[in-house]
């Protein structure tokens, strides 16, 4: 009589997560009598996956009815495969005994699980930065297998090249994670910009997953300030305007100072948005010229997004105002439209207009 052989015809089987895996095994002889067991791995730490003789294996079904007469097909089907099921499975024949004795093993079938990557999550910097600064965005995706994966970055549809990507772990694993960090240089026009992290994997059938982040969460566009005086009104009041333009985000507090004393404080809210996503705001201050003997120094003080205040001063020349309606106004603008912001890298940027 021929010696029993245990045949596992496939060296490897690849299955998508959530599907069933069929692991084939046949014996070449009915002799000796004894059950088949399936193990994952070898040696003392091997894991029992299915035993024909005893045990409860809710996810495992024999392909062929074990009670079928003269059965020599010991293939099994494992349902609802997850990445944790990856490994090499061995079909092992036992000889009937007390206890049954291991007789012969098949060569093993390596089960690899194709698992989709999770939706990429893109996170931006913890603090906002201004134009010309470089900020980092991180993209993470987890739980995929096999390890091969492609990640690309885009800004407004244009592919980025300044990024670094790692896939972990480096060695064999049931599933893998990817983490990529891209460096993006901000411009004043980036309020409406978007960065996209695109992940391509064999499980996605050519339809990559995308994660996005809005640069609006990462950027701060400081305001321009301009203070101007309108015509003298009939009631000896001068209308002084502070125009705050091209700023983002909207969080802004404006304070009027008359000769260094706080006159009024306002908070920006519900402003219309410019095409580029920035905001403009205009504040007026009425100065009663007849109430002043000397020139009035008006200061428009703007605190934007928690940054140090920016001042723009303007002197109203009281002596230049005749006390009748409709006369020309004379004013001297002594302010310097200066914004002084301290950024993460401790550089100072001065803008003069």
């Amino acid at each position: 009589e021929e010696e029993l052989q245990v045949i596992q015809p496939e060296k490897s089987v690849s299955v998508a997560a959530g599907e069933s895996a069929t692991l084939n095994c046949t014996a070449t002889s009915l002799i000796p009598v004894g059950p088949i067991q399936w193990f994952r791995g070898v040696g003392p730490g091997r894991e029992l996956i299915y035993s024909q003789k005893e045990g409860h294996f809710p996810r495992v079904t024999p392909v062929s009815d074990p009670t079928k007469r003269n059965n020599m097909d010991f293939s099994i089907r494992i349902s609802n495969i997850t990445p944790a099921d990856a490994g090499t499975y061995y079909c092992v024949k036992f000889r009937k005994g007390s206890p049954d004795v291991e007789l012969k093993s098949g060569a093993g079938t390596e089960l690899s699980v194709r698992a989709k990557p999770s939706a990429p999550v893109v996170s931006g910097p913890a603090v906002r930065a201004t134009a010309e600064h470089t900020v980092s965005f991180t993209c993470e995706s987890h739980g995929f297998s096999p390890r091969d994966i492609t990640l690309k970055w885009f800004k407004n549809g244009n592919e980025l090249s300044d990024f670094q990507t790692n896939v972990d772990p480096a060695g064999k694993s049931v599933s893998y994670s990817i983490r990529s960090t891209a460096r993006v240089v901000l411009t004043r026009r980036d309020v409406h910009s978007q960065v996209i992290c695109e992940v391509a994997h064999v499980t996605l059938q050519g339809d990559p997953l995308r994660g996005t982040a809005n640069l609006s969460e990462a950027i701060r566009v400081p305001p321009f300030l301009e203070v101007t005086q309108q015509s003298m009104r009939a009631d000896n009041q001068v209308n002084v305007t502070c125009q705050v333009t091209k700023f983002y985000p909207q969080r802004l507090q404006l304070t009027w100072l008359e000769n260094g004393n706080v006159s009024r404080t306002e908070m920006a809210s519900a402003l219309p948005e410019n095409k580029d996503g920035t905001y403009n705001w205009t504040s007026w201050l009425l100065v009663n010229v007849s109430a002043h003997r000397d020139d009035v120094k008006l200061t428009c003080q703007v605190e934007h997004d928690g940054q140090p205040a920016v001042n723009k001063s303007f002197s109203v020349k009281v002596s230049a105002h005749p006390k009748e309606q409709g006369s020309n106004t004379a004013a001297e603008n002594t302010g310097t439209n200066e914004r002084d912001y301290k950024d993460d890298d401790d550089k100072h940027h001065h803008h003069h207009h």
Epitope: L30, V33, Q52, E54, D65, P66, T67, R69, N70
Partner: antibody, heavy 119, light 110 residues
Framework: QVQLVQSGAEVKKPGASVKVSCKAS????????INWVRQAPGQGLEWIAM????????HYNQIFKDRATLTTDTSTSTAYMELRSLRSDDTAVYYC????????????WGRGTLVTVSS | DIVLTQSPDSLAVSLGERATINCRAS??????????IFWYQQKPGQPPKLLIY???NLDSGVPDRFSGSGSGTDFTLTISSLQAEDVAVYYC????????FGQGTKLEIK
């Protein structure tokens, strides 16, 4: 370790029925056939029938087809053999036996249940 | 049905001697290269015990003084050197179709 534990001895009147049980342990009950065999006093072995507990497929010896019924309760891993219309020549030891190799053989046996049919 | 006929009905053999029991089937019990004959030993007051399966394969724990041979319709159980504990009734059984047993052979010590 495979064990088949049978119910105790029974004394029955002619025309009555008897139901013998066989509780299995030490293996997956639904993966192996259970055979029933009887042996009259001083006589040889006589195969009655067999059942597949996984789907209750049965095969009967023609001699017993009309009088014997095999059933199983998979929740308790117990096989049953009911014999109806008992006659005095049904007096015998009734064995259950498990087929470990799906060869229609009898690898492991219960200790037997003596059924005595007497008026 | 396949009928199995054992011979002899009884047999007395001296300790240490060879004992041979025959089993003849009314038609072939061979299929796909296997001979579907099984041998059992039954001692008084005990259930039968499987000795040989598929004509020539020793079951687990059975001493190797027992052996089985034959094919087709004629089969033999041999005990090469009889021991006192071998006194029993021996049955052949086939499973080529639904099972049947031979009538049994009683083995005693001479």
């Amino acid at each position: 370790q495979v064990q088949l534990v049978q119910s105790g001895a029974e004394v029955k009147k002619p025309g009555a029925s008897v139901k013998v049980s066989c509780k299995a342990s030490g293996y997956t009950f639904t993966n192996y056939w259970i055979n029933w065999v009887r042996q009259a006093p001083g006589q040889g072995l006589e195969w009655i029938a067999m059942i597949d507990p996984s789907d209750s497929e049965t095969h009967y010896n023609q001699i017993f087809k009309d009088r014997a019924t095999l059933t199983t309760d998979t929740s308790t891993s117990t096989a049953y053999m009911e014999l109806r219309s008992l006659r005095s020549d049904d007096t015998a030891v009734y064995y259950c036996a498990m087929d470990y190799g799906s060869l229609y053989a009898m690898d492991y046996w219960g200790r037997g249940t003596l059924v005595t049919v007497s008026s | 049905d396949i009928v199995l006929t054992q011979s002899p009905d009884s047999l007395a053999v001296s300790l240490g001697e060879r004992a041979t029991i025959n089993c003849r089937a009314s038609k072939s019990v061979s299929s796909s290269g296997y001979n579907y004959i099984f041998w059992y030993q039954q001692k008084p007051g005990q259930p039968p015990k499987l000795l040989i399966y598929l004509a020539s394969n020793l079951d687990s724990g059975v001493p190797d003084r027992f052996s089985g041979s034959g094919s087709g319709t004629d089969f033999t159980l041999t005990i090469s050197s009889l021991q006192a504990e071998d006194v029993a009734v021996y049955y052949c059984q086939h499973s080529r179709e639904l099972p049947t047993f031979g009538q049994g052979t009683k083995l005693e010590i001479k």
